[in-house]
């Protein structure tokens, strides 16, 4: 990952705008406080990905950590991420606000902790005090994190001076607990099952020697009890798992499964729930719309993406004009189907350096033994326009004609323009548009042909000029959705020699 500017610490001006760029070999994303702020993501032609985060109208509240990380860490070093810390010195912001839970620090052992009082300006002097004391405590301060050390069970506040005023932080409360508080985690082998398949749930608690597990589940309410298995895991101390296994699930087993764990010594408890859905049969459902006409630009790469939900995992096939597609050895086509959550899939067809021949009718089919879905679209290859010919002729009729021929996809528009003052035009004088309605004595005739094999349109336009009394610069401009091209020719009066 490459971050620009590299940091690791930046001090920015309040009210300013600042741009952060991160690039990497896989999709990258900026994160701020575990969220993804609005940002511009792009993929360069050389295959590198980038994300640009523009911070506008900065305030002190923008002070903090910014992380750039891989958007999809599968197959990559999951822990690879770049951290940047930004300060925005802002005299209107004293200490940065804390979440309520950050003000209460619970300990179960003697260990170093951090009192997270942070300011917007790294130059400020910050001191730590007991809530009811004036003496500054000799604890090291890190402007990015706060005060770190071993603290007694007490209340603490931080102080700083901004300009000529003294500012106090919220109070932080440190509590030392003698036993582990219970923290339960629940997971399921699958949260979606078909009737007749098994439901297996696991409830895990760490750090307490003697606990009691109690499960509530839909079947229990109808008096059909299932005996959970308690597993004392051996990988670390006091790692206990309760396994609830329901064989041959029925539709009525859909619902909420709750694991409640209690520890009787201090009467601590925690519970977590998970939802299980039992379906009559498997399903495949498309998510979102994919237009029936898709576009790709000639010689550029294009990824066509279909998002769908399915259970059980489906087989995914792509077809072009009813022929099955596969990853090409030449690397012109890449197919991938990713499981982005338990039942959600993203299937992608990537056409590398698109060719005209790749236009056509595409279908993605996702299926398993219970269901199938297919999605079809026409792929149009857009070809930038080019003017192939611009020629002038003098028919016997006395008029002069200029013929312009060009090609492109989608169909190009043709614009004729002329300039009489060759010295000053087109820089100083705008060219005059020509056409049937123009004040110039001119007429236009345009023909369009679609070339099936090349899958592009050819436009031939003839401009008839009734009388030309002095040299005229005539310009033919072809334009379509993916570009434009211009050529010009000088038309001289009959009377003037070439």
């Amino acid at each position: 990952l490459v971050v620009t500017p590299p940091g690791p610490e930046l001090v920015l001006n309040v009210s300013s705008t600042f741009v952060l760029t991160c690039s990497g070999s896989a999709p990258v994303v900026w994160e701020r406080m575990s969220q993804e702020p609005p940002q511009e993501m792009a993929k360069a032609q050389d295959g590198t990905f980038s994300s640009v985060l523009t911070l506008t109208n900065l305030t002190g509240l923008d002070t903090g950590e910014y992380f750039c990380t891989h958007n999809d860490s599968r197959g990559l070093e999951t822990d690879e991420r770049k951290r940047l810390y930004i300060f925005v010195p802002d005299p209107t912001v004293g200490f940065l606000p804390n979440d309520a839970e950050e003000l209460f620090i619970f300990l179960t052992e003697i260990t170093e902790i951090t009192i997270p009082c942070r300011v917007t300006d790294p130059q400020l002097v910050v001191t730590l005090h007991e809530k009811k004391g004036d003496v500054a405590l000799p604890v090291p301060y890190d402007h990015q994190r706060g005060f770190s050390g071993i603290f007694e069970d007490r209340s603490y506040i931080c102080k700083t001076t901004i300009g000529d005023r003294e500012v106090d932080s919220d109070a932080y409360y440190v509590y030392r607990l003698q036993v582990s508080s219970i923290n339960v985690s629940v997971n399921a082998v699958q949260t979606v099952v078909r009737q007749g398949e098994n439901i297996t749930l696991m409830c895990i608690v760490i750090g307490n020697e003697v606990v009691n597990f109690e499960w509530t589940y839909p079947r229990k309410e109808s008096g059909r009890l299932v005996e959970p298995v308690t597993d004392f895991l051996l990988d670390m101390p006091y790692h206990i798992r309760s396994i609830l296994h329901i064989p041959s699930a029925e539709l009525e087993d859909s619902g909420t499964y709750t694991c409640n764990v209690t520890e009787s010594v201090n009467d601590h408890q925690d519970e977590k729930a998970i939802n299980i859905t039992v379906v009559e049969s498997g399903y495949v459902r498309l998510l979102g719309e994919v237009g029936t006409l898709q576009f790709a630009e000639l010689h550029r790469s294009r990824t066509l993406q279909v998002v769908f939900e399915a259970y059980p995992p489906p087989t995914v096939l792509w077809f072009k004009d009813n022929r099955t597609l596969g990853d090409s050895s030449a690397g012109e086509i890449a197919l991938s189907t990713r499981n982005v959550s338990e039942t959600r899939y993203v299937s992608e067809l990537t056409l590398v350096r698109v060719k005209v021949a790749e236009a056509g009718h595409y279908t993605m089919r996702a299926f398993h033994e219970d269901a199938e879905v297919q999605l079809s679209f026409q792929l149009q290859i857009n070809v930038p326009v080019r003017v192939l010919e611009l020629s002038e002729s003098h028919p016997d009729s006395g008029e002069q004609t200029v013929r312009c021929r060009g090609r492109g996809m989608p169909q190009p528009n043709i614009i004729w323009s002329a300039c009489r003052d060759l010295k000053r035009c087109p820089r100083e004088l705008p060219p005059t548009l020509l056409g049937n309605s123009s004040e110039e004595e001119s007429q236009l005739e345009t023909n369009v042909t679609y070339w099936e094999e090349e899958q592009e349109f050819e436009v031939v336009s003839t401009l008839r000029l009734q009388h030309v009394d002095r040299p005229l610069s005539v310009r033919c401009t072809l334009r379509n959705a993916v570009g434009q091209d211009t050529q010009e020719v000088i038309v001289v009066p009959h009377s003037l020699p070439f």
Epitope: V179, T230, F232, M236, P237
Partner: antibody, heavy 118, light 113 residues
Amino acid sequence: QVQLKESGPGLMQPSQTLSLTCTVSGFSLTNYGVSWVRQFPGKGLEWIAAISSGGSTYYNSALKSRLSISRDTSRSQVFLKMNSLLTEDTAFYFCTRVYYGSNYFDYWGPGVMVTVSS
Amino acid sequence: DIVMTQTPSSQAVSAGEKVTMSCKSSQSLLYGGDQKNFLAWYQQKPGQSPKLLIYLASTRESGVPDRFIGSGSGTDFTLTISSVQAEDLADYYCQQHYGYPFTFGSGTKLEIK
């Protein structure tokens, strides 16, 4: 009272598969884990494998490819299979009870001597 | 894996003497949740299987005489026999029971002069 007893063939040939059984009494395999430990003629102890109260399995990483641990809770038995035997596998094999939560080995069987020789 | 190192490999003492043996682990065996050290000591008399003496570094297994004392924390542990008896002739092994994979020390052989 708590008891564990190992059984299995005393003499094996290289490349064969060793099958050992640990039969327990005085406690339930659904409440406690069971572990296998071996002791070489030179006296060193080496932990081999374990199965937890809920049936999760654990293996010594150096031996993992040759090992399989399983159990039959209704018969109070734990089984260890070790394939592709080598002469270096000659040792006393013990099964132990694993005390839940704290994971120490509070009871040991008398052991069974396994000699691997051609 | 956690490596356990025991010293000395053997020692000879007279009955009634105090003896100490050391066990060091390559990683701390202190579990944060309850500040306990997950180290056990086993005694193996000639021709017998190992027997649990001490667990959690200092807790004596029931039936073990109080002359066996376990101490230490983190990575450094000691087994002390305050007044050696003839029946204490045995090999003594330390083991980390913090968790999988379980590892043993190479043992200390105690001989009676």
